[in-house]
């Protein structure tokens, strides 16, 4: 759990400004999940402020790692039954310390708002939210205060009067083996798991359940997950593939089949064919991680979040491993820098996604007057005199291949190369032996290397041309 700079956002900053040390406080606010109220509205379900706050003394410009959250939990007492669906608002406040703080002592550094579904008694839910340059890591859970138990904290438990068993007609209280259910104030038979009451003899249902005793899932039968009643109600059978397979209803909606198609019964606050539309509006700031809230034409209509690359989910709350989409072609190595993707290309490939095959003449041309020659699924450059390398970008050493035969000495020249032949040899590459009797020169068998005198070569060369 931490509050600190988000990834890829430059040098981490301290939350303190130049006016000296500071402390961070966290204000947690709970609102009804289907609240259409303004963001600044009352925290109808409860609110609390963190305590035992550490002091940070870093100053701007100094590096600041992720900051530890204040010790201990922030407990938000809620009134009445736990609704299951709620809006969670976490504000990070900075309190400036010191005599010369000047200006406002309190500043709101960050504010995250999100709609959540959570049953009481469940495990810790983890979350990461980014707002501006800051990232907040936190966990949350809902717990019932004794004697209340259950997903809505609407069932009451009492300590056992006898160590071994509960009183007549009362069951042990799960998950508290040493406690018994208190005498029911709800309507007799009201489901302890799916129903609750706020007044005697009533039975209110949690989302997804219906019926006078909240024992029927919101679907056409009491069988869950598209199963159908078996013969003589012996149980539920799994039918062949049906329209409700995989439950197309989002956000906890219940699916029921209707003449070859399906129908979703949506929990409070959601609507649409698949319960994909939330009653939260853009005014509630539901899009995380730089997501843009796109609403309908009127202010109260549904919203959709357009997520920046790298995030997904209905509220852009899930980070995507963009490299898993394998955007780099031709075996390039993918690097997700947060603010951008980069591809490190294999030799022979280039481009932002390594899409350009340098072994293809349709790609970049050969430099310095070279000609591209394709063949055998690859390309090579036939370079102009004096150039070499893969793309003819390197100045070539024409003498590197020892082109002068019979000990001829090679000299690089602007037009290519010139061979200075050893005595007794002639030709462009010194390939001919000169006969002493003045007969025609004939190709000679290779001999060992011999030194030649450049002066003599030049003299003979000029003499030969005149």
């Amino acid at each position: 759990h931490s509050f600190g700079p988000g990834p890829g956002l430059g040098t981490p900053r301290s939350p303190c400004n130049a006016r000296g040390p500071c402390r961070l406080f966290f204000r947690v606010c709970l609102k009804p999940g289907v609240s259409q109220e303004a963001t600044e509205s009352l925290c109808a379900l409860g609110a609390a402020l963190s305590t035992s706050v550490p002091v940070y003394t870093e100053h701007p410009g100094e590096s600041a790692a992720a900051l530890p959250l204040p010790d201990g939990l922030v407990r938000v007492p809620f009134r009445d039954a736990w609704p299951g669906t709620f809006s969670l608002v976490i504000e990070t406040w900075r309190e400036q310390l010191g005599e010369h703080a000047g200006g406002p002592a309190w500043n709101l550094l960050a504010r995250v708002v999100g709609r959540r579904r959570l049953a009481a008694g469940g495990p810790w839910a983890r979350d990461v939210q980014r707002t501006g340059t800051w990232e907040l890591h936190f966990s949350y859970r809902a717990r019932c205060e004794p004697p209340a138990v259950g997903a809505a904290c609407a069932r009451l438990c009492r300590s056992r009067s006898a160590p071994s068993r509960c009183g007549p007609g009362l069951r042990p209280c799960t998950p508290f083996p040493d406690e018994c259910e208190a005498p029911s104030v709800c309507r007799p038979g009201c489901s302890p798991e799916h129903g609750y009451c706020e007044e005697p003899d009533e039975c209110r249902c949690l989302e997804g359940w219906t019926g006078p005793l909240c024992t029927v899932p919101v679907s056409t039968s009491s069988c869950l997950n598209s199963r159908v009643p078996g013969p003589a109600s012996t149980g539920c059978l799994l039918p062949g593939p049906g329209p409700c397979d995989g439950n197309p209803c989002a956000n906890g909606g219940s699916c029921s089949e209707t003449s070859g198609s399906f129908e979703c019964a949506c929990p409070r606050g959601f609507y649409g064919l698949r319960c994909e539309v939330s009653g939260v509006t853009c005014a509630d700031g539901p899009c995380f991680n730089g997501g843009l809230c796109v609403g309908g034409e009127d202010p109260d209509s549904a919203y959709v979040c357009h997520c920046p690359p790298g995030f997904q989910g209905s509220n852009c709350e899930k980070r995507v491993d963009r490299c898993s989409l394998q955007p780099c072609q031709n075996g390039g190595l993918c690097l997700d820098l947060g603010h951008a993707l980069r591809c490190r290309c294999r030799a022979g490939f280039a481009g932002p996604r390594c899409e350009h095959d340098l072994d293809d003449c349709a790609g970049r041309a050969c430099a310095n007057g070279g000609t591209c020659v394709e063949g055998g699924g690859s390309r090579r450059c036939s370079c102009a005199l004096g150039f070499g390398g893969r793309d003819c970008r390197e100045r070539a050493d024409p003498c590197a291949s020892r082109p002068c035969a019979h000990g001829g000495r090679c000299y690089a020249h602007f037009s290519g190369l010139v061979c200075a032949c050893a005595p007794g040899y002639m030709g462009v590459r010194c390939e001919f032996a000169v006969r002493p009797d003045g007969a025609d020169a004939v190709p000679a068998a290779p001999r060992g290397l011999r030194q030649a005198d450049p002066q003599r070569f030049l003299h003979h060369h000029h003499h030969h041309h005149h």
Epitope: L9, A38, T39, E40, A110, R111, V112, V113, T131, G132, T133, C282, A283, D284, G285, P286, C287, F288, G290, G291, L292, C293, V294, G295, H306, P308, P309, G310, R322, P327, G338, H339, A340, L341, G351, P352, R353, E355
Partner: antibody, heavy 118, light 108 residues
């Protein structure tokens, strides 16, 4: 460094369709949102709309009925078509890349002036 | 749509002075999704600040953004000659994306 270049006719007649293209160089058009913004002479900036490489689009409601934004991955280009133009559509039209930390604009083309006149 | 009102319309200052530009939103901007741009004559705007307070790449630290909710501020601590330009704020929390009318910072 990524570069954006707008292209298209500088003069369009009233009631006709304004068509502009933005060519993206030194970066792939994939994995970003791409946007159009305009600025009438001597006035402020007005967002027109954006497109994602997946095909997701979002338009300014004031222009939505006349606006089409499309994308050509093969050519690394995206385009704007604004129908039934009037003199009020005379502006410098900019294409821009949407920043990856949110819908601000971190890289802009140099802009192209479009005049609507008969 | 969220309307952004910038003030003052024009700010006449000398090099070395401090400039404070204001941007006020007609409704709360979620998650400080606000950006600032600088535009010089004949040029495209340049992103200075995003997330209300984070400097974009290559922006000098004399540019500082602050604020949340409906009130945001861009501060230029010591004006350099190249800072005289028009500055726009933009919100990107709710569609449609909207810009303020601009503040012109001119040499006094």
């Amino acid at each position: 460094q990524v570069q954006l270049q707008e292209s298209g006719p500088g003069l369009v007649k009233p009631s006709e369709t304004l068509s502009l293209t933005c060519t993206v160089s030194d970066d792939s058009i994939s994995n970003y949102y791409w946007s159009w913004i305009r600025q009438p002479p001597g006035k402020g900036l007005e967002w027109i709309g954006y497109i994602f490489y997946s095909g997701t689009t979002n338009h300014n409601p004031s222009l939505k009925s006349r606006l089409t934004i499309s994308l050509d991955k093969a050519k690394n280009q995206f385009s704007l078509r604004l129908s039934s133009v009037t003199a009020a559509d005379t502006a410098v039209y900019y294409c821009a890349r949407v920043f990856n930390w949110g819908f601000a604009f971190d890289i802009w083309g140099q802009g192209t002036m479009v005049t609507v006149s008969s | 749509e969220i309307v952004l009102t910038q003030s003052p319309g024009t700010l006449s200052l000398s090099p070395g002075e401090r400039a404070t530009l204001s941007c006020r939103a007609s409704q709360r901007i979620s998650r400080t999704y606000l950006a600032w741009y600088q535009q010089k004559p004949g040029q495209a705007p340049r992103l200075l600040i995003y997330g209300a307070s984070s400097r974009a790449t290559g922006i000098p630290d004399r540019f500082t953004g602050s604020g949340s909710g409906t009130d945001f501020t861009l501060t230029i601590s010591r004006l350099e000659p190249e800072d005289f330009a028009v500055y726009y704020c933009q919100q990107y929390g709710t569609s449609p994306l909207t810009f303020g009318g601009g503040t012109k910072v001119e040499i006094n």
